[in-house]
């Protein structure tokens, strides 16, 4: 018998709902935020509901449009951005989606006090990047793979560089493994905090293996896509960094940073660079074996017009236990006197935490310790600190912002937010105005998402910015799901796990359980946030109970369970999922005959391994653009946490750990394989080495692609890709259409 | 009728300042920027800088930076030119016309109504 | 900064005559996005302010009469009277509206011959 979720007959419930894929897709139950966008200590923008960009004052209490909706219909501009001296505005329109964070755009520059498009020497399109300086209007942008800088909107431009080549040499903006796996941005220039300087990275990929696939398109003739795309083991971006000086950029030229000597005796990695002053910068580097990173802090020579990284000021980061850092090695926040700074790494217990770093690395200050990890620091002002961590009451899942007052000895500690929607808002993140007089926080759940302004000095809430209130009355008649966060404790190891329970859940009876997985290195899946999702509707109307576990290798939880997966990928983390399953089923209402698991990407080699680990526990599985062989992804990413596949290295687990050495053990389970034929991040070329394994060992299986799609398989394909996923999942289930 | 009428002449000492003020009437303020233009005898037309009175923001031009500022009270629909540290060549008559505000990229407007002009007379 | 020359400095024209000045601009003032010049032309009567006859290099302003024309493309501009009238005494400037800073030609005086 198939159970379903028995319906209450009283008249309240009768008026309610399940959910259907069609909300999911249509994005019926989606939350808004509210980030302001900061000009000033007092002062943001914000686009109104008209498309009208309105300055806001705080302290005034007044408002007033600074761009009219007509300005921005004009030339459908979709993004915008203000000049510092609030004289321009450029306009971004002809929006091209190239990567994860990269495209590029028309710009046009509106003259705020004329009230016109500034017309003499425009911009020329498409723009891969273009930013104001921090003061003034300077405009810096990269066209063609080349930065050219102005002086004033409607001043002739000034080339930087000449060397910039379409996937040859890149400048100001990153290469497709720097801006995937490295810098996680669209850009590779700097501002000085005056505009002074102007710092940019040059990546040249001339020996880097290209990655090629077709794009189909509409033509007779596919096109082919090339990429510069070092797979692990694969030769990598050369990277150098240069500063100019924008006020003379003709005088000297690009000058440029030297490498430290410890780092440029082998492959290495620029990782970061933050600006201290004017003629202080902060360079982070790390070798290609990602265990050793080196901060270093250089000054620029006014005699010799050059910059010194003397080696007194390079301070070094080093993993005993695994890589450096976390997902990325985290970046410094540099205090007034603009040398000592604060940072946050493993400290002496193996827990992430804020240090103060004054003079060595050695010697360094813990500002915050516990079993539990600092996250993100947002703002140092003269007295206080501002972070993010999951202290509060010991849920890994959770964020609150922190104050420490360092102003004081010794300094005080003060949960902002802990206990301001206690029940609504467990996972907290902040916006913050100049010397951050006031701040946002946006909550993102558990409850319905909220967005508030706070002043900084006291944390008063001064207004609510966004609350959702359309959302929480679209959803008074529908039955969401039950869900709860709560922990297993296996052989010494703490598996956090999100349930989500069909909203007439009963403990009595069985109900068919999903899995949905990532479980990559540093990531986070049982998390308190709100989301209305493909898997609520599975608990809300086809009665599946879906779980989300957090196992080795995931993060916030301290070097031991984070750096459990070094070196040896695709072993515990879906160990972790099996163990999770088991003790699931002990509860009591798991049908064990029915149990399946998916994931993407990551999650998609997690549930790949996991159907084919010959437990016999799932019936069914779905992967969505999985990786299969850690020899076919990016060498940043994979050689983070596998080292090289050579023989005097790691190449033993690399063979042992693809999805294709497992394919005679996909025989006794239902397999759905789905990809993007142009997914430029986890090649197709992953899914083809599966499909051709199962195929030479005679296993049926179910597969489906999605034409000209890339890794996130957007638009029409997303509702077909869960349509058909929804079906693939009943029929597992047995659940009728 | 569009008005722009100007304050009255003032004659004034090398080194002072001189603040002129242009009351408009008839027209929506906020939807023109506010010009100021001199002409000194027997010169030609020499534009000094205007202000949006939507936001404030005013543009000068570089030859007279940091010795004008240009200020709109729009409560009163009236825009004010100051201009210090005078010098003999300042002598000229300060003129405001108004400029339509172009909020598509294809517009730009000439300056179509002008007040009528203040002459102010710098001599020790 | 567009510099803007007019010539000739004078011009002295008989009523009911033609008056021909021209405007050249160091720079294109032409629009690319919409092909407009950004060029008008101004008519200055003793102790008055100046009145705005042509915008966009020829298109006249209302209630100007249609005796003033204007025409050019770039950076060469004419104004034209097509039959001089001696309310038409005065000095006439170009202006480019391009670019910033703005800029006036020196100005053109017309007389009755």
């Known amino acids: 018998i198939v159970l379903r979720p028995s319906r209450v007959h009283n008249s309240e419930e009768n008026t309610m709902r399940a959910l259907t894929l069609k909300d999911i897709l249509n994005g019926t139950f989606s939350y808004k935020t509210f980030f302001p966008n900061w000009i000033s200590g007092q002062e943001y923008l914000h686009q109104s509901a008209d498309n009208n960009i309105v300055l806001y004052n705080i302290e005034t209490g007044q408002s007033y449009t600074i761009l009219s909706n007509r300005t921005m219909k004009s030339v459908n501009a979709s993004n915008y951005g203000l000049s510092p001296d609030r004289q321009f505005v450029y306009l971004e329109s002809d929006y091209s989606k190239l990567w994860r964070y990269s495209y590029t755009a028309t710009y046009y520059i509106y003259d705020l006090s004329n009230g016109e498009f500034v017309r003499g020497n425009e911009l020329p399109r498409p723009i891969q990047y273009l930013c104001w300086s921090p003061v003034g209007s300077k405009l810096a942008y990269v066209y063609q793979n080349n930065i050219y800088l102005k002086q004033r909107p409607g001043d002739p431009p000034f080339q930087i560089t000449f060397n910039g080549r379409e996937n040859k040499i890149f400048n100001g903006i990153p290469d497709w493994v720097y801006e995937e796996e490295m810098l996680a941005t669209k850009y590779a220039l700097w501002w000085s905090p005056n505009g002074k300087f102007l710092a940019y990275a040059e990546f040249n990929d001339t020996d880097i293996p290209v990655i090629a696939y077709s794009y189909y398109g509409d033509e007779q003739y596919p096109r082919t896509i090339n990429i510069p795309y070092p797979k692990a083991g694969a030769k990598n971006p050369v990277v150098r960094i240069f500063i100019i000086d924008t006020t003379y950029p003709a005088y000297v030229g690009p000058q440029e940073v030297p490498v430290p000597a410890m780092i440029a005796s082998s492959d290495y990695y620029f990782s970061w660079l933050t600006w201290v002053t004017d003629e202080r910068v902060c360079l982070q580097w790390l070798k290609r074996v990602q265990n050793v990173s080196v901060l270093s802090i250089c000054d620029f020579r006014e005699d010799w017009q050059t910059w010194d990284c003397p080696k007194t000021q390079e301070h070094i980061e080093e993993s005993r236990t695994g890589w450096a850092g976390g997902f990325f090695v985290s970046t410094p926040v540099f205090s007034y006197d603009a040398i000592s700074y604060y940072k946050i790494f493993s400290d002496k217990d193996g827990y992430k935490h804020i240090h103060y770093i004054k003079d060595t690395v050695e010697n360094a200050i813990q500002i915050t310790s516990g079993k539990w990890e600092a996250i993100n620091i947002f703002r140092v002002t003269q007295d206080s600190l501002f972070y993010s961590s999951n202290e509060f009451e010991e849920y890994p899942g959770r964020r609150n912002i922190y104050r420490i007052s360092i102003g004081s000895y010794p300094p005080s500690k003060k949960c902002v937010t802990c206990h301001l929607r206690k029940e609504r808002c467990q996972y907290y993140t902040a916006s913050f105005s100049d010397y951050a007089k006031y701040y946002a926080l946006v909550c993102y759940g558990p409850g319905i998402p909220i967005s508030t302004l706070h002043d900084g000095r006291t944390d008063q809430e001064i207004k609510i910015l966004e609350e959702n209130k359309e959302l929480e009355n679209a959803l008074k008649n529908i039955q969401l799901p039950k869900e709860e966060i709560k922990k297993l404790e296996v052989d010494e190891i703490t598996l956090w796990y999100k349930m989500i329970l069909p909203p007439q859940f009963d403990r009595s009876k069985k109900y068919p359980l999903l899995i949905q997985v990532y479980g990559g290195p540093c990531s986070q899946s049982v998390r308190s946030v709100f989301a209305v999702n493909w898997i609520s509707y599975l608990a809300s109307k086809e009665g599946m109970v879906i779980a989300l576990v957090d196992g080795r290798g995931t993060a916030f939880q301290g070097d031991k369970l984070l750096y459990a997966v070094y070196r040896k990928l695709g072993v515990y983390e879906v160990e972790d999922q099996i163990t999770a399953v088991r003790k699931f089923i002990e509860m009591g209402f798991i049908d064990e005959k029915r149990i399946a698991i998916w994931g993407w990407s990551y999650g998609g080699y997690v549930s790949s391994l996991a159907l084919a680990s010959g437990t016999g526990l799932f019936k069914c599985g779905i992967a969505v653009a999985p990786v299969s062989s850690w020899e076919y992804y990016a060498s940043v990413y994979t050689e983070r946490f596998m080292g090289l596949p050579t023989k005097d290295d790691n190449l033993e687990h690399y063979k042992n750990s693809t999805v294709m050495a497992r394919a005679e053990y996909f025989r006794n389970v239902d397999y759905l394989l789905i990809h993007g034929t142009a997914d430029d991040n986890v090649h197709f070329q992953n899914s083809a080495q599966i499909a051709k394994a199962l195929v030479n060992a005679q296993v049926d299986f179910q597969a489906m692609w999605y034409s000209d799609q890339n890794h996130g398989l957007s638009g029409l394909s997303t509702n077909h890709l869960y349509t058909h996923m929804t079906h693939f999942l009943k029929q597992c289930f047995s659940l009728s259409d | 009728q569009v008005q722009l009428v100007q304050s009255g002449a003032e004659v004034k000492k090398p080194g002072a300042s001189v603040k002129v003020s242009c009351k408009t009437s008839?027209?929506?303020?906020?939807?023109?920027?506010i010009h100021w233009v001199r002409q000194a005898p027997g010169q030609r037309l020499e534009w000094i800088g205007g202000i949006n009175p939507n936001n404030g923001i005013p543009n000068y031009n570089q030859k007279f930076k940091g010795r004008v500022t240009i200020t709109v009270d729009t409560s009163a629909s009236t825009a004010y030119m100051e201009l210090s540290s005078l010098r003999s060549e300042d002598t000229a008559v300060y003129y405001c016309a108004r400029r339509r505000i172009a909020y598509g990229y294809d517009e730009g407007h000439a300056m179509d109504y002008w007040g009528q002009g203040t002459l102010v007379t710098v001599s020790s | 900064d567009i510099v803007m020359t007019q010539s000739p400095d004078s011009l002295a024209v008989s009523l009911g005559e033609r008056a021909t000045i021209n405007c050249k601009s160091s720079q294109s003032l032409v629009y690319s996005r919409n092909q407009k010049n950004y060029l008008a032309w101004y008519q200055q009567k003793p102790g008055q302010p100046p009145k705005l006859l042509i915008f966009?290099?020829?298109t006249r302003e209302s209630g100007v009469p249609d005796r003033f024309s204007g025409s050019g493309f770039g950076t060469d501009f004419t104004l034209t009277i097509s039959s001089l009238q001696a309310e038409d005494v005065a000095v006439y400037y170009c202006?480019?509206?391009?670019?910033?800073?703005?800029?006036f030609g020196q100005g053109t005086k017309v007389e009755i011959k």
């Open positions: 202006q480019q509206y391009f670019s910033y800073p703005l800029t």
């Open positions: 008839r027209y929506t303020f906020t939807e023109y920027t």
């Open positions: 966009w290099a020829s």
